[in-house]
């Protein structure tokens, strides 16, 4: 029932997971200098009956260089801030979708944990996307992919999000102007931005619903 | 199942303007965006824009910049392609495509410009 | 732009040989790469997605490799109907430009 893939990559785009289904797991990874501690947890596993889901086994990591197990403790935010994990963090999860059943939260962070989170999904997982900082969506199709099993295989679905760091003429609605694209951009720039003003109540709701679900953009 | 239906073939003179036409059907047409590509007789594939079906929005690419113009009818599920100021260059077929990964082409549609 | 180079141009093979088509990318396009089958006067038909992605309702003897600049499609086992062109392709940023395309004949 685990996902043999990662979800797919989208350029100039990252994801995540609002809730983990059932049976997803979270490597215990420290950062640099540290480790997991001897007795220490491999990965958290989200687990659960119809009504609750939780992360069972805790993560801890201890300093390399000693032989000490560190108490489980919030980081502070400054601490919390080179946190950088392949799954967008969002500090707001959207009430509908953490409180799925058969669904986890994300995990609390632990300490001296690892800048990026290692995952391993589960078929029915479902990831959302958003374009990074620079770049805005050309084409907002459905922005999300679901690990899906086929004829005894699992894929994921391809999300349907064009980002672009093309100059503009017009915006989308509650859309801001983009930034320079962080990668910059070559003088002899090889396609044009063209823009109309036909847009639709369903991009206002695409842009409102994206504002809802990632309320802290991670490049 | 997934269909994407182009017009007939065109002959044009030089100088003038043709407008191609690609119905999408089986699917929900503002989910995916549309590309346009084309080959010339005896070459390659050459991209030439994609358009947004749900806002309208088009990159097209530096060589076609100025001559083009892709829009799009949501009511009819259909996508077009208009390319002007023809030259017998322009010889070709030109095909659309679906989505991200240009998982679905139309048929083609062969323009000839001919004086 | 970003250039893509196919080779070989041409290829000569027979049923039930393997056969590698290789694309490079002149820069960094990570997994960002698709292959396309043309068939004389038919439209092209995606093979291959996301550099490793079989597409829907292709055989298994077609598969995908590669990250960055450098990619490989490999067909298994020749079957009589994969005599064609192949194209790369990559979506990393516009223009999405192809590779000039691989010609697989019969030997």
């Known amino acids: 029932e685990l996902c043999d893939d990662d979800p797919p990559e989208i350029p100039h785009a990252t994801f995540k997971a609002m809730a983990y289904k059932e049976g997803t797991m979270l490597n215990c990874e420290c950062k640099r200098g540290f480790r997991r501690i001897k007795s220490g947890s491999l990965y958290m596993l989200c687990t659960g009956n119809s009504s609750h889901s939780s992360w069972d086994n805790q993560c801890q990591c201890t300093s390399s260089a000693t032989r000490n197990t560190t108490k489980q403790v919030t980081p502070q935010p400054e601490e919390q801030k080179e946190r950088k994990t392949t799954e967008m963090q969002s500090p707001m999860q959207p009430v509908d979708q953490a409180s799925l059943p058969g669904h986890c939260r994300e995990p609390p962070p632990w300490e001296n944990e690892a800048t990026e989170r290692i995952y391993h999904f589960v078929v029915g997982q479902m990831v959302y996307y958003q374009c990074v900082q620079g770049y805005r969506a050309l084409h907002r199709g459905p922005a999300e992919s679901v690990c899906k099993m086929t004829h005894g295989k699992t894929r994921w679905t391809q999300p349907q999000l064009i980002c672009t760091g093309e100059m503009e003429t017009s915006q989308f609605p509650g859309e801001e102007k983009p930034q320079a694209s962080p990668e910059g951009r070559p003088e002899s720039e090889t396609s044009c931005l063209v823009t109309t003003t036909d847009f639709q109540i369903q991009t206002e709701m695409a842009a409102t619903m994206e504002t809802s679900i990632f309320t802290t953009e991670y490049q | 199942q997934v269909q994407l239906v182009q017009s007939g073939a065109e002959v044009k003179k030089p100088g003038a303007s043709v407008k191609v036409s690609c119905k999408g059907s089986?699917?929900?047409?503002?989910?995916?965006?549309m590309h346009w590509v084309r080959q010339a007789p005896g070459q390659g594939l050459e991209w030439m824009g994609v358009i947004s079906t749900y806002s309208g929005d088009a990159i097209y690419a530096q060589k076609f910049q100025g001559r083009v113009t892709m829009t799009v009818d949501k009511s009819t599920s259909t996508a077009y392609m208009e390319l002007s100021s023809l030259r017998s260059e322009d010889t070709a077929v030109y095909y659309c495509a679906r989505g991200v990964t240009f998982d679905y082409w139309g048929q083609g549609t062969t323009v000839t410009v001919s004086s | 732009d970003i250039q893509m180079t196919q080779s070989p141009s041409s290829l000569s093979a027979s049923v039930g040989d393997r056969v590698t088509i290789t694309c490079r990318a002149s820069?960094?396009?990570?997994?960002?790469l698709e292959w396309y089958q043309q068939k004389p006067g038919k439209a092209p038909k995606l093979l291959i997605y996301n550099a490793k992605t079989l597409a829907e309702g292709v055989p298994s003897r077609f598969s995908g490799s590669g990250s960055g600049t450098d990619f490989t499609l490999t067909i298994s086992s020749l079957q009589p109907e994969d005599f064609a062109t192949y194209y790369c392709q990559h979506h990393y940023d516009t223009p999405y430009t192809f590779g000039q395309g691989t010609k697989l004949e019969i030997k």
């Open positions: 089986g699917y929900t047409f503002t989910d995916y965006a």
């Open positions: 820069q960094d396009i990570s997994n960002y």
